[in-house]
Interface confidence: medium
Amino acid sequence: MQKGDQNPQIAAHVISEASSKTTSVLQWAEKGYYTMSNNLVTLENGKQLTVKRQGLYYIYAQVTFCSNREASSQAPFIASLCLKSPGRFERILLRAANTHSSAKPCGQQSIHLGGVFELQPGASVFVNVTDPSQVSHGTGFTSFGLLKL
Amino acid sequence: MQKGDQNPQIAAHVISEASSKTTSVLQWAEKGYYTMSNNLVTLENGKQLTVKRQGLYYIYAQVTFCSNREASSQAPFIASLCLKSPGRFERILLRAANTHSSAKPCGQQSIHLGGVFELQPGASVFVNVTDPSQVSHGTGFTSFGLLKL
Amino acid sequence: MQKGDQNPQIAAHVISEASSKTTSVLQWAEKGYYTMSNNLVTLENGKQLTVKRQGLYYIYAQVTFCSNREASSQAPFIASLCLKSPGRFERILLRAANTHSSAKPCGQQSIHLGGVFELQPGASVFVNVTDPSQVSHGTGFTSFGLLKL
């Protein structure tokens, strides 16, 4: 699976984890059918994917959530893919927004984010949502990953 | 387009096909603007993409469907990306769920799934939906593919 | 970041730009956290990504929009990923459709498109939507890109 000793494959796919924390940052785990190619990408503190090598990466996240218009705030459910590199400000790379469903008790919706970005050594990417309590953690519903081009 | 004789590009993109079968597994065809890089990935029985080489693959599917809350079951429309490896149980890799629309006669919605997974030689991936009769087969609406990293 | 002199990395990620033009083709810019790997892929006229080398490309687009059922046409919001190759007719590669929300003044929804396609030298890809005035241009909401396998 090596591209060569100097250019190993770097890829990760991690699985959502329910969390009692009130933070808007989603939690992830190396469980189920996860991918962690080698130590050039790591899952840190269960919340961010950190890369050791500079380069172009395709980064993606999928979030399934269940919400109801009446029970939620006026604002839509937003999922954000964020980047923090050493010596750089936190940046939003991608966002998706879905207005809450009128279905009761809640209506499920899925969001997919993905794009190609330049990452520096030590850069971390993570996923923020407006309301983590609405996220669905059933098998396959919510995941996060990247691959180095 | 070769990475080298030992490491050829492997990729596929197939197009949805309406089916009279009552199975929940979607049917696909090599038609329209499809991709099939070589015989290291094949479309089998019109329903699964099968790979010959072990490795990391980015696998994706897009499903557009049209449904109505009153005419559908209470359960949401769910699309699942599934894996069957030789000698292993079938497993769900990714799922997305969308509650049915209140629009009449039906409301269209699109789901996108994608992630990086390790596949064994002879592994097959396929797409399940809760109600195949609701899937839209117009040009470009529903497709399925993969690429080897 | 080179795969080798003969096989450089080719990738792009561009950011949506609001436009006063009435055309259904979305406008893009090299701004914010964009990617343009080298001159083997270019953004032309702010509307299309053009590649110089033949090969397989993973092409994607994300469109977030805000619409209301009563204020919109009966037809759903459709985003289309289109291809124009030299000497060939324009063709649709991918489409996604979402019925307008009943939320007021409008309900936000996000669409993601992505797939692997063979592109010829000089081929251009672009994104069409049914109503560009409904597209959301806030940070990260709407973007377009590709990567060469």
Epitope: N45, K84, G87 | - | -
Partner: nanobody, 123 residues
Framework: EVQLLESGGGLVQPGGSLRLSCAAS????????MGWVRQAPGKGLEWVSD????????YYADSVKGRFTISRDNSKNTLYLQMNSLRAEDTAVYYC????????????????WGQGTLVTVSS
Amino acid sequence: EVQLLESGGGLVQPGGSLRLSCAASGFTFSHYDMGWVRQAPGKGLEWVSDIDYIGKTTYYADSVKGRFTISRDNSKNTLYLQMNSLRAEDTAVYYCAKASDEVGVNTSKFDYWGQGTLVTVSS
């Protein structure tokens, strides 16, 4: 030791212009995103603008968009803030700040600040 030294502040009439400078030392300036933050009398800190390490990408608070321009000269290790069409509400101490080396979630945006330069907009 990291040092950030602001200059260029002063008294200016409404509608006037000023250019603030920030001389950086003690770190590799060209490797860091930089920003400007201000504190009006009796108020909290307000982010004004920031710029990426190569000067490619800039961001502005809505309150200054179209009037202020952030820039940098990596060869001179200097950050700038050009302020045009100044208003009374722009009166504040302006601080130059360096992006934090921390990574990940809930990290501080800045880790080093200058001493600040006072801008007073008054007729």
